[in-house]
Interface confidence: medium
């Protein structure tokens, strides 16, 4: 229904706290380089604003979209241009072309520094002074580092730090109680973080109809018992509600989640036996729960899939009459079946489905011709089994830092033309595939691999995409996304690659390694493990093994010397010799 | 769960015509597929006609193509059969099914359809 003023309508509905945490979000978002004073202010401004027409609809430019009302805040603020150039140049256009200028300008991946968590008892005291000051500050962080963090979600993890806060702060031992919950929070917000990024790629360079694929898929493995009908309507709805997310309408965004929540606890019984416990939640935690909810059990009875896809002599009529209806609910039947196949290989499928059906529904004889289609499956499957099961097999033996080294020197290998920091990120958050999926059950093993690969590898060619320099990488971030990860794994060393020349300054190191905290010592080891590798692309594992057994064992000798500075200056130039020599 | 009652079957004389009717409840009938199925003595049951859930694509046996035509009035949760120039070996019981959530027949195969009518007689007879 339309209402008179959108502004006031969207803060009745999510009430003030988190009407000005989505506000905050969406400029955090937006002009990701200003400060969180300068923010607030604007987010004070606009809560002001929205609560006047709340009083009075017909106020004042109560009736303007919000689009119109966040833009004109956003091109009020004075030194716009200084701070970010171009995109100032959005404030000439009018809505809807301005809110589509200020998305292409988010940035994935802003020149800010990492987020430095405080210690422990400056944290609860600026926690226990003021706590909203202190999660908005929060939000504002993760926001502009991650311009298109689920906004709804974020305000979820917020809501964690705040329960964690308040329980910790009270403890003697305040780090000991803080350190492992936040990093379990921190842990699954990037997790959150590369999923949604991917939601919106797809989103962006594959339209609704691709995304709707995906939340069919996603929810009939979810909700084997629903109908197809049902699914669809579910699957509508979160394709609408990424859609607005995606596209900056966080509080239309974050209002229709919470409706979807609403309508799905209050149609239980068509939907999945599993979402009692997450109905009885507020309604952050609620959305959360029915997102990561565990699959229903699968129906006893469920016939073959042959006998409606493949057996049926009508199935050309069928697709020639509704083909997106048809191809839809041959997914769902698949999907339903397999909560054990990741959402990427049911696409796979089911677009191999319908080219098979393209095909053969032109020939003379159309059930003879789609008759193998289901056998034709048996290679599309086995193929992210064996990935996983190598893969695996590798993490088991390596463990987290050494599977870590081996997916650096891969995809090193496949593209050494991308930036040492970008390729020490991604095998970083790759190599972590392990101990997040590798431990589970075998039957939830594949999706998650698949699944999380596929997010991590989109965030490679996010940023690829910023700055191309491999021929490889664009070919394979340009396809259709379900096709990625299969398009990365095939990739082989490449042959086009000029090695770079040995900088002895790329391997020079000084006494600060040994200060550092270990993720930071890792990623220092990692970035020379890749400027080796690029270096040298063809070296073998042996070579590798050896050159940075001796790296590690070089930096602990130094940082137990009494002279650590002195040893760095001596024994550093040795070791690049060394190096060199096992190298060549 | 789907309930379906049927009627309108009798006795009639070869090139007549009849009217069965379907009526469904617990379900709307416009989003389930559904058909009409039809068993003569002695036989197993046969497909007869059928129309989409959602999308109105029907279907047809190829023995009653041209005779016999599926509606439903969405208004009445009803299923119709509207069956002319009815031949001897078209008497039999013919039943009503539904497949729920199915937008498409996408099968003929009676053992797919988890509801089922009582069945109404017909009866073409000189």
């Known amino acids: 229904e339309a209402h008179k003023s959108e502004i006031a309508h969207r803060f009745k509905d999510l009430g003030e706290q988190h009407f000005k945490g989505l506000v905050l979000i969406a400029f955090s978002q937006y002009l990701q380089k200003c400060p969180y004073e300068e923010h607030i202010k604007l987010v004070q401004e606009v809560t002001d604003f929205a609560k006047t027409c709340v009083a009075d609809e017909n106020a004042e430019n109560c009736d303007k979209s919000i689009h119109t009302l966040f833009g004109d805040k956003l091109c009020a603020i004075p030194k716009l241009r200084d701070n970010y150039g171009e995109l100032a140049d959005c404030c000439a256009k009018q809505e809807p072309e301005r809110n589509e200028c200020f998305l292409q300008h988010k940035d994935d991946n802003p020149n800010l520094p990492p987020f430095q968590r405080p210690e422990a008892e400056a944290m609860c005291t600026s926690f226990q002074e003021n706590p909203t000051s202190f999660l908005g500050h929060y939000l504002h962080e993760v926001a502009r580092r991650h311009p298109y963090f689920y906004a709804p979600e974020l305000l979820y993890y917020a809501e964690k730090y705040n329960e964690v806060l308040t329980q910790c702060c009270t403890e003697s031992d305040k780090a000991a109680c803080l350190t492992p919950k936040l990093d379990a929070v921190k842990e699954k917000a990037l997790v959150a973080a590369v999923r949604q990024r991917m939601k919106c790629s797809s989103m962006q360079r594959f339209g609704e109809r691709a995304f709707k694929a995906w939340a069919v898929a996603r929810m009939s493995q979810r909700f084997p018992n629903a109908e197809f009908a049902e699914i669809t309507k579910l699957a509508t709805d979160v394709t609408k509600i990424n859609k607005e997310c995606c596209h900056g309408d966080l509080l239309e965004c974050a209002d229709d989640r919470a409706e979807l929540a609403k309508y799905m606890c209050e149609n239980q019984a068509t939907i999945s036996s599993k979402l009692q416990a997450c109905c009885d939640k507020p309604v952050l935690q609620k959305s959360q729960c029915l997102a990561e909810i565990e699959h229903d059990n699968i129906p006893a009875d469920l016939p073959s899939i042959a006998a409606d896809f493949v057996e049926d002599k009508e199935v050309c009529k069928n697709y020639a009459e509704a083909k997106d209806v048809f191809l839809g609910t041959f997914l769902y039947e698949y999907s339903r079946r397999h909560p054990d196949y990741s959402v990427s290989l049911l696409l796979r499928l089911a677009k191999k489905y319908e080219a098979t059906l393209e095909k053969c529904c032109a020939e003379g004889d159309p059930p003879a011709c789609y008759g193998t289609v289901l056998a034709e499956f048996q290679p599309l499957v086995e193929e992210p089994k064996n990935l996983v099961k190598t893969n695996c097999e590798l993490y088991e033996k390596l463990g987290e830092y050494g599977f870590q080294n081996a997916v650096l020197v891969r995809y090193t290998q496949k593209a050494p033309q991308v930036s040492t920091p970008t390729l020490v990120e991604a095998a970083r958050n790759l190599g972590r595939v392990g101990t997040k999926c590798c431990t589970l059950p075998e039957a939830q093993r594949l999706p998650c691999v698949e699944d999380y690969l596929s997010a991590i590898l989109n965030r490679l060619c996010v940023l690829h995409e910023k700055t191309p320099v491999s021929e490889k990488v664009t070919k394979c971030c340009s396809g259709s996304l379900v096709e990625r990860r299969p398009c990365f794994s095939a990739l082989t060393v490449d042959e086009t690659y000029v090695p770079k020349e040995f900088k002895a300054e790329t391997f020079t190191f000084h006494s600060d390694i040994c200060t550092l905290p270990d993720k930071e010592k890792q990623i220092k080891k990692q970035t020379a493990l890749a400027e080796l590798v690029k270096h040298k692309p063809k070296a073998t594992e042996d070579q590798l093994k050896t050159v940075m057994g001796d790296f590690a064992q070089f930096v602990d000798k130094c940082c137990k010397a009494a002279d650590k500075d002195n040893c760095f200056a001596t024994e550093g130039p040795n070791l690049v010799a060394r190096s060199k020599e096992a190298l060549a | 769960e789907v309930q379906l009652l049927e009627s309108g079957g009798g006795l009639v004389q070869p090139g007549g015509s009849l009217r069965l009717s379907c009526a469904a409840s617990?379900?709307?009938?416009?989003?389930?597929?559904v058909a009409w199925f039809r068993q003569a003595p002695g036989k197993g049951r046969e497909f007869v006609a059928g129309?989409?859930?959602?999308?109105?694509?029907?279907y047809y046996a190829d023995s009653v193509k041209g005779r016999f035509t599926i509606s439903r009035d969405n208004s009445k949760n009803t299923l119709y059969l509207q069956m002319n120039s009815l031949r001897p070996e078209d008497t039999a019981v013919y039943y009503c099914?539904?497949?729920?959530?199915?937008?498409?027949?996408?099968?003929?195969?009676?053992?797919?359809?988890?509801?089922w009518g009582q069945g109404t007689l017909v009866t073409v007879s000189s």
């Open positions: 099914a539904a497949r729920p959530g199915r937008p498409l027949i996408t099968s003929k195969v009676a053992d797919l359809y988890p509801y």
């Open positions: 129309i989409g859930g959602g999308v109105d694509i029907t």
């Open positions: 617990g379900r709307y009938i416009d989003e389930t597929a």
